[in-house]
């Protein structure tokens, strides 16, 4: 499987929300022994390897905020840990999976990856991410609900391991 | 926070058999396999099997198969392994370990304190 | 059965020093993963996926290795990591841990 992000780009306003969104696309196993790990978490743009380095969204780390669920179920984050913090994942049956962040800050500016991994029986198979950068402005120049850039196909098709 | 309280010591005739409980707290129960694990002195961990309490699919080491049966009650977030026809071999402390997914990777994430089973005449 | 072969099985070292103890696998791994057991106590989860720290390990310890040879380091002994270290498999039923190495402090 692949992922791809439809959005590489989100500029949004201090206080609205934002839902960032990863796909899983191509084939996905729904044997009973697969599951999906899946979860988001801040980096930088590396040199080497863009979510290479792993930082934490509003000091919550990727374990934190991670979801893991077989291949053919829905899942959301509902531990109060993340709700506490304007923080929640979802992943539906469509392999959409996305994280929403409420009541946005300038702090909350800057690059998101998502990572997926297939677990095949306890061993991780295949892992994958996707980058997107949310932009958050205030004062007269920043819109007034967010403004989304889709991703170049070349882009949204490409897969890192991670 | 994930905990795992297995039940106390046992001292058992050979020939005997002997039901070990490991009750979860702390985490969906019925999502991650729970694991049981042998250790004798001198000898190191040696992994008996594994139970998903939600389906109560099981896996077995070939070594254990007829030793060792693994039940789960998810009413009560309760593992249980029974071991039968205990000898002196069977003397060891017993763990109940939970899967944990981390950063992608499953593994042993949290263990109970142990259960020591000691085999005498 | 993937057989962990642990080298050495006991391993003596003043505070301050280097130590590197090593697991073998029989059949080359994606991935290892070790566990510390202080006596007395249950293991616990200390290294995963051959590289990446435990939340609440030390900064000192480390990991490294691929295919069949793998390698737990700690830059700088301390008194507290005496300690027996685990390597595991869980690529194939059974699922194995390697005999363990053995650390003591002088």
């Known amino acids: 499987f692949k992922v791809a992000t439809p959005y590489s780009l989100y500029v949004c306003p201090e206080g609205q929300n934002v839902t960032l969104t990863c796909r899983l696309l191509g084939p996905v196993d729904k044997g009973h022994d697969v599951t999906f790990y899946k979860t988001w978490y801040r980096s930088s743009r590396g040199e080497v390897q863009t979510c290479s380095e792993r930082r934490p969204i509003r000091n919550l780390t990727f374990q934190d905020l991670h979801l893991h669920h077989g291949g053919h179920q829905a899942a959301n984050t509902s531990h109060d840990l993340a709700q506490r913090h304007g923080l929640e994942s979802a992943s539906d049956h469509h392999g959409n999976f996305s994280i929403t962040m409420r009541n946005l800050t300038l702090l909350d500016s800057g690059l998101y990856c998502c990572l997926v991994v297939e677990i095949r029986h306890h061993h991780s198979e295949h892992r994958v991410h996707g980058a997107m950068e949310l932009q958050v402005q205030t004062g007269k120049d920043a819109p007034s609900n967010c403004v989304v850039y889709p991703s170049s196909s070349q882009d949204s098709e490409n897969i890192t391991a991670a | 926070q994930v905990q795992l309280q297995q039940s106390g010591a046992e001292l058992m005739k050979p020939g005997a058999s002997v039901k070990i409980s490991c009750k979860a707290t702390?985490?969906?129960?019925?999502?991650?396999?729970i694991e049981w694990v042998k250790q004798r002195p001198g000898h190191g961990l040696e992994w008996i099997g594994e139970?998903?309490?939600?389906?109560?699919?099981?896996n077995y080491n070939e070594k254990f198969k007829g030793k060792a049966t693994f039940t789960a009650d998810t009413s009560s977030n309760t593992a249980y392994m029974q071991l039968s026809s205990l000898t002196s071999e069977d003397s060891a402390v017993y763990y109940c370990a939970s899967e944990e997914v981390y950063d992608g990777y499953p593994w042993f994430g949290y263990w109970g304190q142990g259960t020591l089973v000691t085999v005498s005449a | 059965q993937i057989v962990l072969s642990q080298s050495p099985a006991i391993l003596s070292a003043s505070p301050g020093e280097k130590v590197t103890m090593t697991c073998r696998a029989s059949?080359?791994?994606?991935?290892m993963h070790w566990y510390q057991q202080r006596p007395g106590s249950s293991p616990k989860p200390w290294i995963y996926?051959?590289?990446n720290l435990a939340s609440g390990v030390p900064a000192r310890f480390s990991g490294s290795g691929s295919g069949t040879s793998y390698s737990l380091t700690i830059s700088r002994v301390e008194a507290e990591d005496a300690a027996t270290y685990y390597c595991?498999?869980?690529?194939?039923?059974?699922?194995?841990f390697g005999g363990g190495t053995k650390l003591e402090i002088k």
């Open positions: 595991q498999q869980w690529s194939s039923n059974p699922y194995t």
């Open positions: 702390g985490y969906t129960f019925s999502r991650y396999w």
């Open positions: 139970i998903l309490p939600g389906s109560g699919s099981t």
């Open positions: 996926a051959t590289s």
């Open positions: 059949s080359s791994l994606s991935y």
